[in-house]
């Protein structure tokens, strides 16, 4: 800031320092600094320093403060959705038998039509309409990797419910990968959670779009509410505008 | 606000409305409202309305905006830590054999000494020092429920690493439960993630405090770095102060 | 929290979220947004007194820090805390578009 | 983002995070906080121009909304965006205490 602003800057600094004095005392609920009359001489005990250091250290898996949104997130995102490939498609044939899993495949050409470039994607959600559920169920979501290998993505504990409910899984990273790769069909697997010592691995939850024996209108409604990817992305023309204005202010 | 302030309020409203005009156009990267000359007559297509409604609905599992911190979170939190009960304690005897899990038990009297009331606890983290790891490992954390039943809490994908690293799991809810109950010893289990179709369930990761055959100083250092609960809580005397000043401003 | 539950039902003179419904047609003269017809934008208004100086080290003032200047700013300001997005439907040529606009609805305010 | 990486290395005149190290002993005259000896508190400073009126509907101004008034406030204000906590060690009587103070360190600012 210019030199003429130095006095203002110093004044603001002084007011900020003054305010911090009040802030710290206030946060500690102290009317004035605590008496130091009982403090023993010498350094802090080792255990106290260890505790202080534990508190100070950011560690793996600890939720830090949320990151401020990047500049691109200020701009509007176009919303599209891509429905799951219908279950009578041949891709499902080799996966039909399982009692612990259901499979959801998506046509990547449809995804590319909605989002031409991976970098444009700002959020992708897998949405599933969960029908009523009698017992609590712990489910896991996997991404199809190579031929028959699956990569764990996330999990959810589903509470019993008498009414249908939409579930949402954040799959932004996965869809961004799919848009970068050449594959035609990509997919997810929803499985019962299996612990190492428990062998009860039946998927109890009923997801709309997988139940059989429906006819006519009901099947159509059912099909419309089948799993889908909700995509939020920067439109291509807006993105080009963004790239050209990368300079600061 | 008092009637004398009405004019100010109206002015602010007008400026806010004006600003929103610019904000919406800016977010859409439009210099002016779009031409409506090509818009077909009639209502919006069903599919578009469905998509609009999908976007508008908050659904289970979708990350909403972060909640603003409650008043109590403004105030300082006292930090304490409770080390895991050492592994030579008899409580571990019945759990020693497993290849897919390690067990961590805590003395609830120590927890209660640190946090006398469950409501005072604002955060509890289980911290584990992970030693070097040769392969990627997917681990799960469970809470001891009844005699031999375990409740799933969370999971973590651990990347290979040549250096030790502290891991942190948020276990606030669990510790709050423990503080409310009468139990003397409560515990966690860290297990290899087992998918329903894979049977490779060996826990590869080496957590400090569980390896055997150490002597003297090394064992002490090792013991000090054994798993612990890092607790952040409102001190009792500050909480009473908070309750008495529940009135607004 | 200085949210809609508290602020809309009180006569709070200090920083609070204030009601403001924007009707796209009436307020902005716009007919091009097809859905929604308007939305509760709301706004933040009210003073955030600067309440600390060296001669004010007493409990009454300190207890007010939480509301008036929790961030210990040199010039605290009443600003949005919790915000929500707004989806809209409009046409580009013959094509209807659904777009999500981030941070359009003010749910609560804070002194910052 | 108007964060320490950008602001500390630029001569930005508008809203930005500014460097401020608080030494508890020198700046506050306090000897009672045993750890840390001080901390980088930082602060937000700089104008957030109000850049919209009915006669300014053109691209140049609209592109600036992002920085100057993203929240479409009637009086945009330069305030903290990302904040971090500060743990401290002090004595209560003979007993050392570790306490965590939330939102003490300003990492980035925004016009709001």
């Amino acid at each position: 800031l210019s030199t003429s602003k130095t006095i203002d800057m110093e004044l603001v600094k002084r007011k900020r320092i003054e305010a911090i004095r009040g802030q710290i005392l206030s946060k500690l609920r102290l009317a004035s600094p605590p008496s130091q009359g009982e403090v023993p001489p010498g350094p802090l005990p080792e255990a106290v320093l260890a505790l202080y250091n534990s508190t100070r250290d950011r560690v793996a898996g600890e939720s830090a403060e949320p990151e401020p949104e990047p500049e691109a997130d200020y701009y509007a995102k176009e919303v599209t959705r891509v429905l799951m490939v219908e279950t009578h498609n041949e891709i499902y044939d080799k996966f039909k038998q399982s009692t612990h899993s259901i499979y959801m495949f998506f046509n990547t050409s449809e995804l590319r039509e909605a989002v031409p470039e991976p970098v444009l994607l700002s959020r992708a959600e897998l949405r599933l309409l969960r029908l009523k559920l009698k017992v609590e169920q712990h489910v896991e979501l996997y991404q199809k990797y190579s031929n028959n290998s699956w990569r764990y993505l996330s999990n959810r504990l589903l509470a019993p419910s008498d009414s249908p409910e939409w579930l949402s899984f954040d799959v932004t990273g996965v869809v961004r990968q799919w848009l970068s790769r050449g594959g035609e069909i990509e997919g997810f697997r929803l499985s019962a959670h299996c612990s190492c010592d428990s062998r009860d691995n039946t998927l109890q939850v009923d997801i709309n779009g997988f139940t059989t024996g429906r006819r006519g209108d009901l099947a159509t409604i059912h099909g419309m509410n089948r799993p889908f990817l909700l995509l939020m992305a920067t439109p291509l023309e807006r993105a080009q505008h963004l790239q050209s204005s990368r300079h600061r202010r | 606000l008092s009637t004398s302030k009405t004019i100010d309020m109206e002015l602010v409203k007008r400026k806010r409305i004006e600003a929103i005009r610019g904000q919406i156009l800016s977010k859409l990267r439009l210099a002016s409202p779009p031409s409506q000359g090509e818009v077909p007559p009639g209502p919006l297509p069903e599919a578009v309305l469905a998509l609009y409604n999908s976007t508008r609905d908050r659904v289970a599992g979708e990350s909403a905006e972060p909640e603003p911190e409650p008043e109590a979170d403004y105030y300082a939190k006292e930090v304490t830590r409770v080390l895991m009960v050492e592994t030579h304690n008899e409580i571990y005897d019945k759990f020693k054999q497993s290849t897919h899990s390690i067990y961590m038990f805590f003395n609830t009297s120590e927890l209660r000494e640190a946090v006398p009331e469950p409501v005072l606890l604002s955060r509890a983290e289980l911290r584990l020092l992970r030693l070097k790891l040769k392969v990627e490992q997917h681990v799960e954390l469970y809470q001891k429920y009844s005699n031999n039943s375990w409740r799933y809490l969370s999971n973590r994908l651990l990347a290979p690493s040549d250096s030790p690293e502290w891991l942190s799991f948020d276990v606030t809810g669990v510790v709050r439960q423990w503080l409310s109950r009468g139990g003397e010893i409560e515990g966690f289990r860290l297990s290899a993630h087992c998918s329903c179709d894979s049977r490779d369930n060996t826990l590869q990761v080496d957590i400090n405090g569980f390896t055997t055959g150490r002597r003297g100083d090394l064992a002490t250092i090792h013991g000090m770095n054994r798993p612990f609960l890092l607790l952040m809580a409102t001190p009792l005397e500050r909480a009473q102060h908070l309750q008495s000043s529940r009135h607004r401003r | 929290a200085l949210d809609t539950n508290y602020c809309f039902s009180s006569t709070e003179k200090n920083c609070c979220v204030r009601q403001l419904y924007i009707d796209f047609r009436k307020d902005l003269g716009w007919k091009w947004i097809h859905e929604p017809k308007g939305y509760h934008a709301n706004f933040c208004l009210g003073p955030c007194p600067y309440i600390w100086s060296l001669d004010t080290q007493y409990s009454k003032v300190l207890a007010l820090y939480n509301q008036h200047n929790p961030g210990a700013s040199a010039a605290p300001c009443c600003v949005p805390q919790a915000l929500e997005p707004l989806p809209i439907v409009y046409y580009v040529g013959r094509k209807p578009k659904v777009e999500q606009l981030s941070n359009m609805i003010v749910r609560s305010c804070k002194c910052s | 983002a108007l964060d320490t990486n950008y602001c500390f290395s630029s001569t930005e005149k508008n809203c930005c995070v500014r460097q401020l190290y608080i030494d508890f002993r020198k700046d506050l005259g306090w000897k009672w906080i045993h750890e840390p000896k001080g901390y980088h508190a930082n602060f937000c400073l700089g104008p957030c121009p109000y850049i919209w009126s009915l006669d300014t509907q053109y691209s140049k101004v609209l592109a600036l909304y992002n920085q100057h008034n993203p929240g479409a406030s009637a009086a945009p204000c330069c305030v903290p965006q990302a904040l971090e906590p500060l743990p401290i060690v002090y004595y209560v009587g003979r007993k050392p205490k570790v306490e965590q103070l939330s939102n003490m360190i300003v990492r980035s600012c925004k016009c709001s």
Epitope: P41, G42 | - | - | R25, K31, R94
Partner: antibody
Framework: EVQLLESGGGLVQPGGSLRLSCAAS????????MTWVRQAPGKGLEWVSA????????YFADSVKGRFTISRDNSKNTLYLQMNSLRAEDTAVYYC????????????WGQGTLVTVSS | DIQLTQSPSSLSASVGDRVTITCRAS??????LNWYQQKPGKAPKLLIY???NLQSGVPSRFSGSGSGTDFTLTISSLQPEDFATYYC?????????FGGGTKVEIK
């Protein structure tokens, strides 16, 4: 204004006793630990004893342990040093000082009182 | 007990000179070191606390540095009123101990 005023010094025979006082003013006495430091003629400073604000904790140099006791009366804003079994090497100017903080620096000192142990 | 060794025990300097006094501890004392100034017939006066912090009211020509076992008191430009004896003191552990002192005399 912080003031510390020592009294009670004088001539005493070896083996005798003496009680030094330090009257404090200008600050909240009970909030501060207090200390005694002595200086033999022509020599350097030697720390003698200290006491916490409440009087609950006391500290002594090895050279006076078991012979000297430190105490305080917070209602009278006064610090004491009871010296028994005095020796010739205890001859010195005795200063009382205020312990400023948990770092144990002595920020205010009295003018001192002379204790002479001689037969 | 922790021993503090001051050097030099005395020095002669002129007004305007830069003067450096060192204090060495027999074991590490972190930054638990204070510096005092004493003039003949007067009580000591605190100059520097916690190795490097200037006590309120003390001229800025005085500065302290160091950590662990080696510490320094520096007077950047000696003034007439600075001719005195200077003591270091450790507060790392009881018994608290002082250095032997450094007498700064007029050359």
């Amino acid at each position: 204004e912080v003031q510390l005023l020592e009294s009670g010094g004088g001539l005493v025979q070896p083996g005798g006793s003496l009680r030094l006082s330090c009257a404090a003013s200008g600050f909240t006495f009970a909030d501060y630990a207090m200390t005694w430091v002595r200086q033999a003629p022509g020599k350097g400073l030697e720390w003698v004893s200290a006491i916490s604000g409440s009087g609950a904790a006391t500290y002594f140099a090895d050279s006076v342990k078991g012979r000297f006791t430190i105490s305080r009366d917070n209602s009278k804003n006064t610090l004491y040093l009871q010296m028994n079994s005095l020796r010739a090497e205890d001859t010195a100017v005795y200063y009382c000082a205020r312990v400023s903080s948990g770092h144990w620096d002595f920020d205010y000192w009295g003018q001192g009182t002379l204790v002479t142990v001689s037969s | 007990d922790i021993q503090l060794t001051q050097s030099p025990s005395s020095l002669s300097a002129s007004v305007g000179d830069r003067v450096t006094i060192t204090c060495r501890a027999s074991q590490s004392i972190s930054s638990y070191l204070n510096w005092y100034q004493q003039k003949p017939g007067k009580a000591p006066k605190l100059l520097i606390y916690a190795a490097s912090n200037l006590q309120s009211g003390v001229p800025s020509r005085f500065s302290g540095s160091g950590s662990g076992t080696d510490f320094t008191l520096t007077i950047s430009s000696l003034q007439p009123e600075d001719f005195a004896t200077y003591y270091c003191q450790q507060t790392y552990t009881v018994p608290l101990t002082f250095g032997g002192g450094t007498k700064v005399e007029i050359k």
